[in-house]
Amino acid sequence: GITIPRNPGCPNSEDKNFPRTVMVNLNIHNRNTNTNPKRSSDYYNRSTSPWNLHRNEDPERYPSVIWEAKCRHLGCINADGNVDYHMNSVPIQQEILVLRREPPHCPNSFRLEKILVSVGCTCVTPIVHHVA
Amino acid sequence: GITIPRNPGCPNSEDKNFPRTVMVNLNIHNRNTNTNPKRSSDYYNRSTSPWNLHRNEDPERYPSVIWEAKCRHLGCINADGNVDYHMNSVPIQQEILVLRREPPHCPNSFRLEKILVSVGCTCVTPIVHHVA
């Protein structure tokens, strides 16, 4: 990894758990310079592998609401608007970091957690399994 | 929102910035129960809207490495393996949370940050703009 000189103005940490426990400012800074309001908003419907978004809510997690994509079909939509089963719709998944309240129900104490979410779907050529 | 009774065993927080600043345990808990080892690993190549993955590294961020998808073509791959420009490859984007070292170079002090990442690509029917 890259070694960075420590800033002398850093908060002091005498915590015996350091560096496992850190201070985090929850005032979110939004670095999304991309101001295109549409972004992926209508792709779910226009895609050849369309998907629906399902709300996943968990008050013990931050963010408490995550949207999960579920592909509508196993096949993909062809030029005629019909499902073509010679192609496969598959979910595009990503591991993301969330904060989990620990101990439970605590407003100011969290643990980092990695979860797998489905962001949308894409159309792929199927894997052909050859029988020996 | 859902009101949850506070756990009496929560760490005490006398910090004047509370609840903006919280304690976070960086020992990541991996909740990915989905044990399908393949996941999205080969979809980038098999997709009709294939993409390449680019490494984005920033030592001031946690996680320091994020992979960004970039669609290979403007169009989509058709059944003959050629690019069909009557369809569009578009990136599926997601807002994710990362931790940004604040003040810079501090090992134990962070601020939550929201960034927009491209996770993969999907093939969509183009929007037709009719000229008046």
Epitope: K70, R72, L74, Q93, S118, V124, I127 | -
Partner: antibody, heavy 124, light 113 residues
Framework: QVQLQESGPGLVKPSETLSLTCTVS????????VSWIRQPPGKGLEWIGI???????DYQSAFKSRVTISVDTSKNQFSLKLSSVTAADTAVYYC??????????????????WGQGTLVTVSS | DIVMTQSPLSLPVTPGEPASISCKSS????????????LAWYLQKPGQSPQLLIY???TRQSGVPDRFSGSGSGTDFTLKISRVEAEDVGVYYC?????????FGQGTKVEIK
């Protein structure tokens, strides 16, 4: 507990529109999709179509030109409209909840809860 | 449309004895991406609406007794009842949820001898 209840006129005249309502309780509308299925007297089951959690729909091609499925989330109600009916549309009509499975990334077309069904007779 | 063919159409059974129903699909129901077979079994008891017994070929729906089991892959599937009980009578349907429209078999009527 999960409940679905179909309601609507038991008799419809040929060429008119069959309209049924499915009132649901015990589950979250934003999570689940709902299908309509019918069963002609003494026959098997036939899937008509589905309305997804976001209000989008998918219909069996045989019905596409004359079927509409919609939802009124404020009333927890789904509706089925089938136009230009004939005697062949006489059946018991069911609404059913599509199964929702966490950590499974496809819409599900298995039905895990059904209404009691309502018989619609098409006759003049 | 995918044709689901069940056999037998009528099955007289003796309580305590095993029973087996076959369902054949006109196309494979195995999805290559996740190796799941998109087949379910329902039971419609007399005067009632159908109830889901098994999905993905062999996964029992919660609350379904373990005397019910499903097997098969591709185009050939079987529902087995290890020991039939009086409450198991009714019409059993298989259903595929791979291809739209999602079609059902014509049903197998199970009755006590």
């Amino acid at each position: 507990q999960v409940q679905l209840q179909e309601s609507g006129p038991g008799l419809v005249k040929p060429s008119e529109t069959l309209s049924l309502t499915c009132t649901v309780s015990g589950f979250s509308l934003p999570s689940h999709s709902v299908s309509w299925i019918r069963q002609p007297p003494g026959k098997g089951l036939e899937w008509i179509g589905i309305i997804w959690n976001n209000g989008g729909t998918d219909y069996q091609s045989a019905f596409k030109s004359r079927v509409t499925i919609s939802v009124d989330t404020s009333k927890n109600q789904f509706s089925l409209k089938l136009s230009s009916v004939t005697a062949a549309d006489t059946a018991v009509y069911y609404c059913a909840r599509n199964m929702y499975i966490t950590d499974y990334y496809y819409e599900n077309y298995f039905m895990d809860a059904w209404g009691q069904g309502t018989l619609v007779t098409v006759s003049s | 449309d995918i044709v689901m063919t069940q056999s037998p159409l009528s099955l007289p059974v003796t309580p305590g004895e095993p029973a087996s129903i076959s369902c054949k699909s006109s196309q494979s129901l195995l999805f290559s991406e996740n190796q799941k077979n998109y087949l379910a079994w329902y039971l419609q008891k007399p005067g009632q609406s159908p109830q889901l017994l098994i999905y993905w070929t062999s996964t029992r729906q919660s609350g379904v007794p373990d005397r019910f089991s499903g097997s098969g892959s591709g185009t050939d599937f079987t529902l087995k009842i290890s020991r039939v009980e009086a409450e198991d009578v009714g019409v059993y349907y298989c259903q595929q949820s791979y291809y739209t429209p999602y079609t059902f078999g014509q049903g197998t009527k199970v009755e006590i001898k």
